[in-house]
């Protein structure tokens, strides 16, 4: 997977006054990063794996851009037109990534009030819209508004590119995030389901990167899909991620279903506790 | 309307220097990057590079970059291409296309090609 | 430099008949565009942004796919759809196409 830097920013408007202040999180390889702490106007890191990306260094760069970024989204939900009564939320993902051959993306993304109408990839400057005639008006309104706003010159997407990429690869020169390997735990619990069924569940937490198989297998075998129910892969807080896989099986025949987890080229097997 | 005229095919010899050009029209040339397109005979489509015409920025693929030259004259609203150091490779059909802003724009508009045949 | 693989590099259909023409991308992209080139003439954008027509481009084309997996189908083929069709992408630099399918009326 590439290495990656999301900014995700939302403001909002009351019966057609932009509210002052703004939410904003960062994510780093996926991972819950930064966010704004609204009540100390400071960027703040999320768990002790953040706080180790940057060391000693200050968090007064992040600071600076998120209310720089922040102010900037309030300024373009101000100029969005007909904003009916009510609350409404603008919202602007700008994601970067480093691929594994060193090529690399960037892209911009508007909502208003959730539904995606406007996108922009910053280093070919295109920009995209969904079909939506609702769409197609919101989007128009505001990048009329960006490109009649000096600082949102062609220089200045390249400039979006060109920080959000030199942040990565800053992030990424402490090492933290940087192609480390984090073997999962893996625990089998079972519950009681209908009569003469149990639920085995297996959970895999604490690992990294996310890539991972966690299936349950039966006489060496892998169930079908159809068979068992999967949770997504989930940040758990603290750089790495967790997630289930739980299938049915009858009472008495707990020992012949394993649960099999591969991870970063390793792979184990766990049985069902009898 | 909208128009990209290419100049005419070019015969040259191998290790000589070819500058094809594309005249636009119909819009303002400034707005809008200029790229250009190789196609070799019966062959596919390959991406050279573009041209900013506001700024002169240029964007090239590797495999052009260090034969391949990208200007642009403002007042004469043409882009011009130049290969060096020609060889039997380089014999092709070059397109210039006009990129866009909204994604409904990029890559409408093409010239005719200007065909380029490097032989001894 | 992200690689597009289509295929078929060549096919025929008979009027009337399904078309769909298949390209796979190296590394996940967002949008997917497509042009119709026929012999002599310059390449003309037929569908972009995935899934959005060029101007002109009657109905019966299509274009759908995600990430690395991406197609254009033609619901009833007709003799003027006989060309080549290239996927592109600009999702960064450079921009690639891929190889073309030729596609020939039966």
């Known amino acids: 997977e590439p290495h990656s830097l999301r900014y995700n920013l939302t403001v909002l408007s009351w019966d057609g006054s932009v509210q002052s202040g703004f939410l904003a999180e960062v994510h780093l390889d996926g991972q819950p990063f930064l966010r704004y702490d609204r009540q100390k106007c400071r960027a703040k890191p999320q768990g002790q794996w953040a706080e180790d990306v940057l060391g000693n260094k200050t968090w007064d760069r992040e600071t600076r851009d998120l209310t720089g970024n922040g102010k900037d989204l309030r300024m373009t939900l101000a100029h969005i037109k007909d904003q009916k009564e009510g609350l409404h939320s603008l919202q602007e993902i700008r994601v970067c990534e480093i691929h594994e051959d060193n090529s690399t993306r960037s892209s911009q993304h508007f909502y208003y009030d959730g539904e995606l109408f406007l996108s922009q990839n910053l280093e070919t400057e295109e920009w995209t819209v969904p079909q939506s005639s609702r769409a197609q008006t919101l989007a128009m309104n505001v990048r009329n508004f960006l490109k009649e706003d000096a600082m949102k010159t062609k220089t200045h997407y390249h400039a979006m590119h060109a920080d959000c990429l030199q942040e990565l690869r800053r992030y990424l020169e402490s090492g933290v995030v940087l192609r480390r390997t984090v073997p999962p735990m893996v625990n089998v619990t079972r519950s009681e389901a209908s009569e003469g069924n149990i639920t085995v569940t297996c959970r895999a937490s604490s690992f990294y990167p996310r890539n991972i198989i966690l299936t349950w297998r039966q006489d060496g075998v892998s169930l079908s899909h159809d068979t068992q129910q999967w949770g997504d892969v989930l940040p758990d807080g603290n750089g790495t991620y967790q997630t289930w896989v739980a299938t049915r099986i009858c009472r008495g025949e707990e020992q012949r279903f394993t649960c099999y987890m591969e991870h970063s080229g390793n792979h184990s097997t766990h049985p069902v506790p009898s | 309307q909208v128009q990209l005229q290419q100049s005419a095919a070019e015969l040259a010899r191998p290790g000589a220097s070819v500058k094809m050009s594309c005249k636009a029209s119909?819009?303002?040339?400034?707005?809008?990057?200029m790229h250009w397109v190789k196609q070799r005979p019966g062959q596919g489509l390959e991406w050279i590079g573009y041209i900013n015409p506001s700024s002169g920025y240029t964007e090239y693929n590797q495999k052009f970059k260090d034969k391949t030259t990208l200007t642009v004259d403002k007042s004469s609203t043409t882009s011009y291409m130049q290969l060096s150091s020609l060889t039997s490779d380089n014999s092709a059909v070059y397109y210039c296309a006009r990129g866009g802003d909204w994604d409904v724009d990029w890559f409408v508009y093409w010239g005719q090609g200007t065909l380029v045949t490097v032989s001894a | 430099q992200i690689v597009l693989t289509q295929s078929p590099a060549i096919m025929s259909a008979s009027p009337g008949e399904k078309v769909t023409i298949t390209c796979s991308a190296s590394?996940?992209?967002?949008?997917m565009h497509w042009f119709q080139q026929k012999p002599g003439t310059s390449p003309k954008l037929w569908i972009y942004s995935t899934s959005k027509l060029a101007s002109g481009v009657p109905a019966r084309f299509s274009g759908s796919g995600s990430g690395t997996s991406h197609s254009l189908t033609i619901s009833r083929m007709e003799a003027e759809d006989a060309a080549t069709y290239y996927c592109q992408h600009r999702s960064t630099y450079p921009f690639t196409f891929g190889s073309g399918t030729k596609l020939e009326i039966k």
């Open positions: 119909g819009y303002t040339f400034t707005s809008y990057t």
């Open positions: 590394s996940s992209i967002s949008y």
